[in-house]
Every structure is written in C-alpha cells, then in structure tokens.
Interface confidence: low
C-alpha cells in the first residue's frame, strides 16, 4: 500500500465474527523469526474517542516539548499488543472477543479477530508486526453493516397469500450474487426460479404460499470483494402444520 493509496476496506456484519486480515510479506531471511514475532494492533474509531485510553497506551509515545503540544490526540488506541512470548496487553480490560490466532501467528498471519464485531469497532486499523530488527505494517478500514430480511406484507400469512422477501445488507454497492435457500432437516436446499418462486436480485416473490412454506428461509449475499453475509427469516403461514 503506497502512501496516499486507498486504505483497503474490510466489511463485517454487526454481531458476527470479523477478521481483520494482516499477512505482510516477510522476507525469507526473517521467516525463522516468526515464532518470536510480536504484533501491535491500533484502532482509530470512526466516531468519538474510545471510552478510556489506558495508561499503557499513553506511555508508549514520545514526550511533548511543552504542554501546549499535547492537544486532543490521540483518539487512536492500542487494541491488542502481543509480545514475542505471547504476552498480551492493550486497552483495559482486555476483552476476550479480541483475538489473535496463535497458530496463524507462527505462519505469518497476524489477523485480528473480533468475535463478535460491534458498531463501535468501525474505523481504521493499523498493525505493526515486530520482527527482530524490523517491523512490517498492515492498514485497513473496517466498515460494519446490518443485515436484515423483511417480508412484505409482514407478519403471519394465510394459505394462498403472496409475500415478497427482501434480503439486504447496509452497504452502498450491490451484491455480486444473491443465493436463496431453505433450511430443512437435512441442511440447506437451494431455492430455484419456478412458478412458486420468482427471484429478482435481492427479492424473492412467492405468489401463493402454503403451510409447507412455513419455516426458515435464508439468503446469502456475496460481494465483489468476497465478503458474504447469510440472513435468515422465519416465515409463518397459518394452516395445517407442514409434515416434519
């Protein structure tokens, strides 16, 4: 990533696990150092400062020449810092939802996992991977979206009613593909275009529902960058229970 180049954007779904990828190109001569590598992840939130910036973070910086130089910086804070021995430090209290994969770290994958991702996690992230005598960095912007499936008309349906299911994710670009499925006992069954199912982009039109249509319906939105989100909706059609 050249200075001035666009920071890569990673999308995640609020409430779902999110991976913030970081696998920098490590020179061959440094591969043996991976076991001893450390990594520091910092986050600059999109909105508002973090609730607290631990003393640990404030101690990392150089000393100002005069109090007037302190200013309101930084809103950026250390999310997690893992030393060569695996010692963790960061914003207190250390949250179990912020994780690094230990095995991945030894393979050169320093990705940060948020399990789950929350709205306040949006913003710019930087990682510094510390080898013996050098450090490499990763940079990305995390955007969080909300997934939803809505039915029109909403609520319970009667046999022979029509319904339109709309699968959406709050992201400005359109999904590259939309796949619809039903959850059956034996797993996911794809929904294909038929007289009973009309598919149009992120919409599924059922012209005449029956009690057999009761139960979970799902869609998978896949975007050009590979991000995908799975959304479920439980359809209720009044009448005889469908056979199990």
């Amino acid at each position: 990533l050249q200075p001035g180049a666009e920071v890569p954007v990673v999308w995640a779904q609020e409430g779902a696990p999110a991976q913030l990828p970081c696998s920098p190109t490590i020179p061959l001569q440094d591969l043996s150092l991976l076991r001893r590598a450390g990594v520091t992840w910092q986050h600059q939130p999109d909105s508002g400062p973090p609730a607290s910036i631990p003393a640990l973070d404030l101690l990392q910086g150089p000393h100002p020449a005069a109090p007037s130089s302190w200013g309101p910086r930084p809103r950026r804070y250390t999310v997690l810092s893992v030393g060569p021995g695996g010692l963790r430090s960061g914003r207190l209290p250390l949250q179990p939802r912020v994780q690094l994969d230990e095995r991945g770290r030894q393979r050169g994958d320093f990705s940060l996992w948020l399990r789950p991702a929350r709205r306040a996690d949006a913003g710019e992230y930087r990682a510094a991977v510390h080898l013996r005598d050098r450090a490499l960095s990763c940079r990305l912007r995390l955007r969080l979206g909300q997934a939803s499936m809505t039915a029109s008309p909403p609520g319970s349906l009667r046999a022979s009613d029509w319904v339109i299911l709309n699968c959406s994710f709050s992201r400005p670009d359109r999904p590259a593909s939309v796949h619809w499925f039903r959850n059956r006992g034996q797993g996911r069954v794809p929904v294909r275009e038929s007289p009973h199912h009309h598919l149009a982009e992120s919409f599924l039109f059922l012209p005449q529902v029956s009690p057999m249509d009761s139960g979970p319906w799902g869609c998978i939105l896949t975007y050009r960058d590979g991000f995908n989100v799975s959304i479920m909706y439980n359809l209720t059609v009044l009448g005889l229970e469908p056979p199990t």
Epitope: P3, G4, E6, T40, Q42, Q44, D46, S47, D57, L58, Q60, G61, P62, H63, P64, A65, S69, W70, G71, P72, R73, P74, R75, R76, E124, R126, A128, D133, R134, A135, S137
Partner: antibody
Framework: QLQLQESGPGLVKPSETLSLTCTVS??????????WGWIRQPPGKGLEWIGS???????YYNPSLKSRVTISVDTSKNQFSLKLSSVTAADTAVYYC????????????????WGQGTMVTVSS | DIQMTQSPSTLSASVGDRVTITCRAS??????LAWYQQKPGKAPKLLIY???SSESGVPSRFSGSGSGTEFTLTISSLQPDDFATYYC????????FGGGTKVEIK
C-alpha cells in the same frame, strides 16, 4: 483515495505575508485523529518542518519560525492554511502540506501522505 | 532543538550494491525516527517509521535500525528506482529533518 492539494500565490513581495491553503480530499479532517502539517524545502536544500494543526485548532510550530507562523483549519471546507509573515528571500521554497501520522506514538509523528508541493518565490 | 546529522551527504553506488545511510541525533530520540525517499520534483515518500517499521507497500530491501542517537537506513540491493535523496526525521520533540543523502549512480 486521500489527496492533499496546496494552493496560493507563487510570488510574494518581501515583508508581506505568504498565505497558502491545503485542501484535503478523500477523508474528513474533523473525523480523523491526525495532525496536518506544513513543510518547506528551499531550492536545492533540505526539508524544514513549519508546524502542524489538529482539527480542533490545536497547533504546534517550529520554534525558529513560531513568531511569524499561523496555521489555521476550516473543517467546513476540509482545508487548513498557512500564513507566514514578514517574508524575505530566505523563505523562497517549495511548500508542502502533509498528514502527520502518529501511529504507535502519542504526540508527534511522521508524514505519511504529502501534497505535490507549490513553489513560492519571495521577490520584489 | 534536536539536530539531525546525516552522512554521507552524497553516495555513489551501483545497482545491486548494499547501501547504508547514517543519521545521528544531537540527543536521544528513543526510536522516534522516520526515513523518507525523495525524487527530483516530487514530494518525499515515507519509507520507515519508528526507526525500523516499514510503511505498508515499501519493498523489503529497505530496512531501518538503531535507537537513541544513532540510526541507519539500509538498502540491501540497490535497484534503478532507488537513486534518489533520502532524509531522516526525528519526532521525539517537535520535528526536525536531517540534511539529506543523495544516492547517485557510480
């Protein structure tokens, strides 16, 4: 893509005030935790930091230029500006605006994104 | 003020050479040092921050080391695109640049 663009007169008379503006596009000055700085480079010479500003208006200046420098910010226009008073021929330089990145620090930083620079000549 | 002194001021080298540039601070600056590359008519480009951390996208042949008052920038195998002027910058107390090192073709 974040870009910085300097603008202002290319010629300033001695004893007058040099005024330059840096327009930031691709990011909002007021939504980031970066400082925004001015650096200059006289022809054939090295780089000299002039000063930096935070979106809230907090500034800090090179002590050797402090008495002549004012840096201000206009968040509504996503711009920050430099005023250098009582200029002489020694102030002839290419003036750069840049983003100061304090990654892994808390106070000062390195300049990770620069404008292309604008040449200012002080001459009568 | 912290003064930064770079040496040499000019360095002649050939493609494939290992090149080392030194930067000395007049007082300790811990690891708060950056290195930049500048080509004629262009703005400087950040290569290294915090003495040894490579900016994203910078080729791995560029590496920085040192702490306190003595720092080095090493280009492990000089490439045609690397002929330029290199500057160090301290950011421990205010911000000051070194005088620059011009790497030219031998």
């Amino acid at each position: 893509q974040l870009q910085l663009q300097e603008s202002g007169p290319g010629l300033v008379k001695p004893s007058e005030t040099l005024s330059l503006t840096c327009t930031v596009s691709g990011d909002s000055i007021s939504s980031s935790s970066y400082y925004w700085g001015w650096i200059r480079q006289p022809p054939g010479k090295g780089l000299e930091w002039i000063g930096s500003i935070f979106y809230s208006g907090n500034t800090y200046y090179n002590p050797s230029l402090k008495s002549r420098v004012t840096i201000s910010v206009d968040t509504s226009k996503n711009q920050f500006s430099l005023k250098l008073s009582s200029v002489t021929a020694a102030d002839t330089a290419v003036y750069y605006c840049a983003r100061e990145d304090d990654f892994l620090t808390d106070y000062y930083g390195a300049f990770d994104i620069w404008g292309q620079g604008t040449m200012v000549t002080v001459s009568s | 003020d912290i003064q930064m002194t770079q040496s040499p001021s000019t360095l002649s080298a050939s493609v494939g050479d290992r090149v080392t540039i030194t930067c000395r601070a007049s007082q300790s600056i811990s690891s708060w040092l950056a290195w930049y590359q500048q080509k004629p008519g262009k703005a400087p480009k950040l290569l290294i921050y915090k003495a040894s951390s490579s900016e994203s996208g910078v080729p791995s042949r560029f590496s920085g080391s040192g702490s306190g008052t003595e720092f080095t920038l090493t280009i492990s195998s000089l490439q045609p695109d690397d002929f330029a002027t290199y500057y160090c910058q301290q950011y421990n107390s205010y911000l000051t640049f070194g005088g620059g090192t011009k790497v030219e073709i031998k």
